[in-house]
């Protein structure tokens, strides 16, 4: 039975320009995680394996930063990235857990930034 | 230039082990995955497992699970793949390959090492 | 385990002939695919990753395509120097697999 949950930071926003880090935590199970994978919709943007270390799509290699932990540093944030961004949890033996962050990136100076996972 | 030299070729018997080595030069050996792949006469690609240099971690193939023993020597920049329990379906060409910085993709290979397991 | 289900197995073509080759994951992988050449008694090489990007020096006249579970691989118009057998992999989770490979040969 898969006991655990994912916590996330929720909806976050961040200014244009800025930076910002996606992070997820899985509590409640003593399953080992093998992979955290973040997503788009349709696309990969990086793989956190956890013997193989760190894979970065192309299209997102210069302003994806790794970490800190498991979690994913967004860079040169752009409107364009304001939507849901998943982190998916692969784990023994449990399987998959999945959790979601809504991004919004403002034109605006005045963001109300995430609490404790924004970068200053 | 990214280079990987793989031993040559061996031949054991049924039920031994075989120990191949993958020297790396022209890069920063703690920076790329390594990939051990093999390949069966007329057969496609299969992958055994990878290591991260870095830290030592490893991962398989469950096929490959118990039976393979992926090292790195950070001294030599050298990968090893160890191979034990062998049977005649073992008999590959197995290959090392290397992937890049923050990349799962087999940007580098070496040039293959056969491995005949024959009585 | 992921399965990669390449199409055709084997393909007949002559000089400047168009060819596509098909992959087929068994989950949805995102764009987490390569397409490797091989040559016979020679090492696999890298071509196409995730799953758009051409390799550093391989010709133009390579591209792929896809996302999610169906993945494209095609020579705009084919060289002598292209038979060959290409493979496609995944490598969104481990173990990472490969198609079973498909053999461009000459007509």
């Known amino acids: 039975m898969m006991t655990g949950t994912i916590e996330t930071t929720g909806n976050i926003s961040a200014e244009k320009g800025g930076s910002i880090i996606l992070q997820c935590h899985l509590s409640s199970t003593t399953a080992q995680v093998t992979q955290v994978n973040w997503e788009q919709q349709d696309q990969l943007l990086a793989i956190c394996n956890a013997d193989l270390g760190w894979h970065i799509s192309p299209s997102f290699k210069d302003r994806v930063a790794p970490g800190p932990g498991l979690g994913l540093t967004l860079q040169s944030l752009t409107v364009n990235d304001t939507g849901e961004y998943f982190c998916i949890y692969h784990t023994y033996p449990d399987g998959t857990y999945t959790g979601r962050i809504f991004l919004e990136v403002l034109e605006s100076s005045v963001a109300e930034h995430g609490a404790r996972f924004q970068i200053p | 230039q990214v280079q990987l030299v793989q031993s040559g070729a061996e031949v054991k018997k049924p039920g031994a082990s075989v120990k191949i080595s993958c020297k790396t030069s022209g890069y920063t050996f703690t920076e790329y995955t390594l990939h051990w792949v093999r390949q069966a006469p007329g057969q496609g690609l299969e992958w055994i497992g990878g290591i991260n240099p870095n830290n030592g971690g490893t991962s398989y193939a469950q096929k490959f699970q118990g039976r393979a023993t992926l090292t790195v020597d950070t001294s030599t920049s050298t990968a090893y793949m160890e191979l034990s329990s062998l049977r005649s379906e073992d008999t590959a060409v197995y290959y090392c390959?290397?992937?890049?910085?923050?990349?799962?993709?087999?940007?580098?290979w070496g040039q293959g090492t056969l491995v005949t397991v024959s009585s | 385990d992921i399965q990669m289900t390449q199409s055709p197995s084997s393909l007949s073509a002559s000089v400047g002939d168009r060819v596509t080759i098909t992959c087929r994951a068994s989950?949805?992988?995102?764009?987490?695919v390569v397409w490797y050449q091989q040559k016979p008694g020679k090492a696999p090489k890298l071509l196409i990753y995730?799953?758009?990007y051409r390799y550093t020096g391989v010709p133009s006249r390579f591209s792929g395509s896809g996302s999610g579970t169906d993945f494209t691989f095609t020579i705009s118009s084919v060289q002598p120097e292209d038979f060959a057998t290409y493979y496609c992999?995944?490598?969104?989770?481990?173990?990472?697999?490969f198609g079973q490979g498909t053999k461009l040969e000459i007509k």
């Open positions: 989950q949805d992988v995102k764009n987490a």
């Open positions: 992999q995944q490598h969104y989770s481990t173990p990472f697999t």
């Open positions: 390959a290397g992937s890049g910085y923050y990349d799962y993709s087999f940007a580098y």
């Open positions: 995730s799953p758009s």
